[in-house]
Interface confidence: low
C-alpha cells in the first residue's frame, strides 16, 4: 500500500499575528513528507507546501484573500518514495488517499493575535499631550495596497493608553478607537506612555502585549508651549 508506515501529523496549531499566519504541526518526518491543503467552508481544497520536510506552512497568502472567511486546513503525510516523482499529486501508487489530520477551523478576523503596538510619536502642547500609535501595516491587500490594522478592523479595534508621571508609579488610562489619544497632563511634569491594542468584542486574543515604554524627554516627543 502507498500509505504504509506513514505517521499522521498531530498537534496542529495555528500561529497568527496581524494576519501573518503559519500552520505548525508535529512530528519531524522520518521516511515521509507533508503536504498541506487549505479551503474555505464552501471552496475547493488548495494544496500548499508540497512534499515538505518542514513541520510548518505559511498560509498567509491564502487567508488574507478574505480575513472574514472561515478556513479549514489539513496536513497529509505522504510516503517518501511516492513524493519523488515531481507530480503534484497526493495519492499513493494505488490511488488511495494518504493519512491526514484536520486543523481546527481558523477565522482570521477573530483568531489572529494582535501584534505588539508601537508608539509613533507624542507631542505636548501646554497641558495636553497627543500620543499617536503607529498604524501597523498588515499583509492584507486591497487594490494592490497593503491595509493597515485600522483599515482591517475599523472600530472593532481600540487602543488603551497607560500613562504615568516619571516620578511616580500611579498609572492612568485612556482609550481610543482611532490611533490617537489626547490627554491632560500637569505642566512641567515628564510622563511615560505605553499602549495596548484591544478588540473588545472578542472573547479570546482580545489584547496585545504592551508596547515598549516611551517617556517624555526622549527623541520621539515634541514640546510646544
Amino acid at each position: 500500500s502507498g500509505t504504509t508506515n506513514t505517521v499522521a501529523a498531530y498537534n496542529l496549531t495555528w500561529k497568527s499575528t496581524n494576519f501573518k499566519t503559519i500552520l505548525e504541526w508535529e512530528p519531524k518526518p522520518v521516511n515521509q513528507v507533508y503536504t498541506v491543503q487549505i479551503s474555505t467552508k464552501s471552496g475547493d481544497w488548495k494544496s500548499k507546501c508540497f512534499y515538505t520536510t518542514d513541520t510548518e506552512c505559511d498560509l498567509t497568502d491564502e487567508i488574507v484573500k478574505d480575513v472574514k472567511q472561515t478556513y479549514l486546513a489539513r496536513v497529509f503525510s505522504v510516503p517518501w518514495r511516492n513524493s519523488t516523482h515531481g507530480k503534484e499529486t497526493l495519492f499513493g501508487t494505488h490511488g488511495e488517499e494518504p493519512p491526514f489530520t484536520n486543523a481546527r477551523k481558523f477565522l482570521p478576523y477573530r483568531d489572529t493575535k494582535l501584534g505588539q503596538p508601537t508608539i509613533q510619536s507624542f507631542e505636548q502642547v501646554g497641558t495636553k499631550v497627543n500620543v499617536t500609535v503607529e498604524d501597523e501595516r498588515t499583509l492584507v491587500r486591497r487594490n494592490n495596497t497593503f491595509l493597515s490594522l485600522r483599515d482591517v478592523f475599523g472600530k472593532d479595534l481600540i487602543y488603551t493608553l497607560y500613562y504615568w508621571k516619571s516620578s511616580s508609579s500611579g498609572k492612568k488610562t485612556a482609550k481610543t478607537n482611532t490611533n490617537e489619544f489626547l490627554i491632560d497632563v500637569d505642566k512641567g511634569e515628564n510622563y511615560c506612555f505605553s499602549v495596548q491594542a484591544v478588540i473588545p468584542s472578542r472573547t479570546v486574543n482580545r489584547k496585545s502585549t504592551d508596547s515598549p515604554v516611551e517617556c517624555m524627554g526622549q527623541e520621539k516627543g515634541e514640546f510646544r508651549e
Epitope: 485600522r150 483599515d151 481600540i158 492612568k172 481610543t176 478607537n177 482611532t178
Partner: antibody
Framework: QVQLQESGPGLVKPSQTLSLTCTVS?????????WSWIRQHPGKGLEWIGE???????RYNPSLKSRVTISVDTSKNQFSLKLSSVTAADTAVYYC??????????????????WGKGTTVTVSS | EIVLTQSPGTLSLSPGERATLSCRAS???????LAWYQQKPGQAPRLLIY???TRQTGIPDRFSGSGSGTDFTLTISRLEPEDFAVYYC?????????FGGGTKVEIK
C-alpha cells in the same frame, strides 16, 4: 467648527443609482473620525446606511449592503454614497454625519455629533 | 440586529412639566454606545446625550440620561417651549447601528 453639506440630485428614476456627496468643511476628513450616512423616510424614523473611515474601511447596514457603496476622497475632503437599483421605497431625506470623538475620560464612545442639514431624494419616473 | 423600542410613542405635556422617555433594547447594549437625539421638523437630529448619561457640550442640564443593559431613560426635568420635538435613542455598538422609533413630545 466642522460642518457637513450634502449634495446631489433631488430626483432619481427607479432602477437607477442614487449618488450623493458630503463635503466636510472646517476640519479634515482625515482627522481620525468615521463618517456616516443616515436616511429618514417621510414621516418615519432614522435608518443608518453605513460609515467609512478616511482610509476607506467601511461598514454597511446588512439590509442595504448589496446596493450600497460608500467612498472617500481625502483630497476633496468629501465622502460619497451610491445606492443602486433604487425604488420608491428609497425616497427619503439623506443625512451625512460625523461619528466622533471616540475617547473621553478614559472611555470610548460612539455617537454622531455633527450632522448635515439633509437632502431630500425622491425616486420617481 | 438590536431593536430599540421607544415608549410612549407620543407624550402630551405642558411647559414646566417633567418628561420621562423610555428606550428598551432587544438585547443588552453597552452604555458607552447609547445616545439620545432631538429632532425638530425640517431639521437634522441633534445629539443630546452620549454614553447613556453624558450631556453633549451646550445641552442644558434639564436633560439627563440614565440606564444600562436593556433599559435606558431620557428625562427632561422641566419642559421649555423649545423642547417640544421628537426624541430618538440610538445604539452604535453593533452593526447595523439602530435607532428607536422615536417619542414625540407635544404640547398638551
Amino acid at each position: 467648527q466642522v460642518q457637513l453639506q450634502e449634495s446631489g440630485p433631488g430626483l432619481v428614476k427607479p432602477s437607477q443609482t442614487l449618488s450623493l456627496t458630503c463635503t466636510v468643511s472646517g476640519g479634515s476628513i482625515s482627522s481620525g473620525q468615521y463618517w456616516s450616512w443616515i436616511r429618514q423616510h417621510p414621516g418615519k424614523g432614522l435608518e443608518w446606511i453605513g460609515e467609512i473611515y478616511y482610509s476607506g474601511s467601511t461598514r454597511y447596514n446588512p439590509s442595504l449592503k448589496s446596493r450600497v457603496t460608500i467612498s472617500v476622497d481625502t483630497s476633496k475632503n468629501q465622502f460619497s454614497l451610491k445606492l443602486s437599483s433604487v425604488t420608491a421605497a428609497d425616497t427619503a431625506v439623506y443625512y451625512c454625519a460625523r461619528d466622533a470623538p471616540y475617547y473621553y475620560g478614559g472611555g470610548y464612545y460612539y455617537y454622531m455629533d455633527v450632522w448635515g442639514k439633509g437632502t431630500t431624494v425622491t425616486v420617481s419616473s | 440586529e438590536i431593536v430599540l423600542t421607544q415608549s410612549p410613542g407620543t407624550l402630551s405635556l405642558s411647559p414646566g412639566e417633567r418628561a420621562t422617555l423610555s428606550c428598551r433594547a432587544s438585547e443588552s447594549v453597552d452604555s458607552s454606545y447609547l445616545a439620545w437625539y432631538q429632532q425638530k421638523p425640517g431639521q437634522a437630529p441633534r445629539l443630546l446625550i452620549y454614553g447613556a448619561s453624558t450631556r453633549q457640550t451646550g445641552i442644558p442640564d434639564r436633560f439627563s440620561g440614565s440606564g444600562s443593559g436593556t433599559d435606558f431613560t431620557l428625562t427632561i426635568s422641566r419642559l421649555e417651549p423649545e423642547d417640544f420635538a421628537v426624541y430618538y435613542c440610538q445604539q452604535a455598538g453593533v452593526v447595523p447601528y439602530t435607532f428607536g422609533g422615536g417619542t414625540k413630545v407635544e404640547i398638551k
